[in-house]
Interface confidence: low
Amino acid sequence: HSDPARRGELSVCDSISEWVTAADKKTAVDMSGGTVTVLEKVPVSKGQLKQYFYETKCNPMGYTKEGCRGIDKRHWNSQCRTTQSYVRALTMDSKKRIGWRFIRIDTSCVCTLTIKRGR
Amino acid sequence: HSDPARRGELSVCDSISEWVTAADKKTAVDMSGGTVTVLEKVPVSKGQLKQYFYETKCNPMGYTKEGCRGIDKRHWNSQCRTTQSYVRALTMDSKKRIGWRFIRIDTSCVCTLTIKRGR
């Protein structure tokens, strides 16, 4: 993950990243919107791999928990919002079918704006 | 991917998302910074799965290619920047070893700020 602070930059929204195991995650939402169970281990040729994910979300403790940094507040309301992406994971659906499905995981914290209509 | 526009919101940075196959990707950077080859297919219990990834990056054609939307320009310079995250992929390293490694993929477009020191 590139670190803007190293270049003397600030993010409009502060985020935190962490490795999340399937054991911590337990369930996820797949592309069809259904809830699936995320399996803890994935069989590979040389045994089993622990299934885990690199997740990034908005920092609930940070400066930007109330709104985005650097916004022109005269014209905009702002909010930092965690966005999601899809990654493939070994899962089990409600019918106990095990398979590789794309699930949604938190991957970023972005700023969304709503325009101030009048003063 | 949640769509702010549906809620009457705008993103500070415009992004585009697409599914990218391993064939299109060919290589990637792993967590140690080494270049690895991304294999086109993954063996699973019932045959093979095409390996592909959901990628999001800054829209080079969008309004925000020059800077972020909604920023207080009196105090800040801004730039939309593609950020990366890690996903597990079946890869081959320079030593011809095939294995599951975390590789970097584009997952978001965020706004970075630098403060304007003088007027």
Epitope: - | M31, S32, G34, D93, S94, K95, K96, R101
Partner: antibody, heavy 121, light 107 residues
Framework: DVQLVESGGGVVRPGESLRLSCAAS????????MSWVRQAPGEGLEWVSG??????????YYADSVKDRFTVSRDNSKNTLYLQMNSLRAEDTAVYYC????????????WGLGTLVTVSS | EIVLTQSPGTLSLSPGERATLSCRAS???????LAWYQQRPGQAPRLLIY???TRATGIPARFSGSGSGTEFTLTISSLQSEDFAVYYC????????FGGGTKVEIK
């Protein structure tokens, strides 16, 4: 000068366990991939196991003949490579060499003198 | 798995003579991913050649490697007393495997 010194060999009965160590010096141990290679008495060389350096999350690799019985690990703070050998068999009798993998691929540019493991009832 | 077959098993030569050792692979080895090692009695193996023909650091010019595909050769142009040893080839196009070795002995 690069030095690799193996220890921990000895005589054990079939089914028993043994842990080999390899103390490394003369190079930045943590960043290099390392391997164990063995040589049965009067026989040729056989690659046993390898482990990636710090850039590769210390991922282990094994030959089919030892998979599920041997475990390779490393302690970068101690500049030491380990090989935990469980469920030993007579055919595991060999001199076990610790070897530093070359950066460009899995061949071995430095070797230790080896430690002898004898599995016999 | 790539199987490497070395020949001859034993080579009896006199000092000063030329030694030619062969290593044949069960399938083609990409980009000459082959190494040669020397092992003297009671010593650890020593890397001589990698990538088929590149001499390792400190290896004398009398040692040379050649070949591609499935046929590889190690040549010692003029045998010195310290060269009498066992020589192994090793491929790294796949998981590492070694040949059975060629013993070069004094005639």
């Amino acid at each position: 000068d690069v030095q690799l010194v193996e220890s921990g060999g000895g005589v054990v009965r079939p089914g028993e366990s043994l842990r080999l160590s390899c103390a490394a010096s003369g190079f930045t141990f943590s960043i290099y991939d390392m391997s164990w290679v063995r040589q049965a008495p009067g026989e040729g060389l056989e690659w046993v196991s390898g482990i990636r350096g710090s850039g590769g999350d210390a991922v282990p690799y094994y030959a089919d003949s030892v998979k599920d019985r041997f475990t390779v690990s490393r302690d970068n703070s101690k500049n030491t490579l380990y090989l935990q050998m469980n469920s030993l068999r007579a055919e595991d009798t060999a001199v076990y060499y610790c070897a530093k993998e070359n950066n460009r691929s899995i061949f071995f540019d430095y070797w230790g003198l080896g430690t002898l493991v004898t599995v016999s009832s | 798995e790539i199987v490497l077959t070395q020949s001859p098993g034993t080579l009896s030569l006199s000092p000063g003579e030329r030694a030619t050792l062969s290593c044949r692979a069960s399938r083609s080895i990409g980009r000459s991913f082959l190494a040669w090692y020397q092992q003297r009695p009671g010593q650890a193996p020593r890397l001589l050649i990698y990538d088929g023909s590149t001499r390792a650091t400190g290896i004398p010019a009398r040692f040379s490697g050649s070949g591609s595909g499935t046929e590889f050769t190690l040549t010692i142009s003029s045998l010195q007393s310290e060269d009498f040893a066992v020589y192994y080839c090793q491929q790294y196009d796949d998981w590492p495997s070694f040949g059975g070795g060629t013993k070069v002995e004094i005639k």
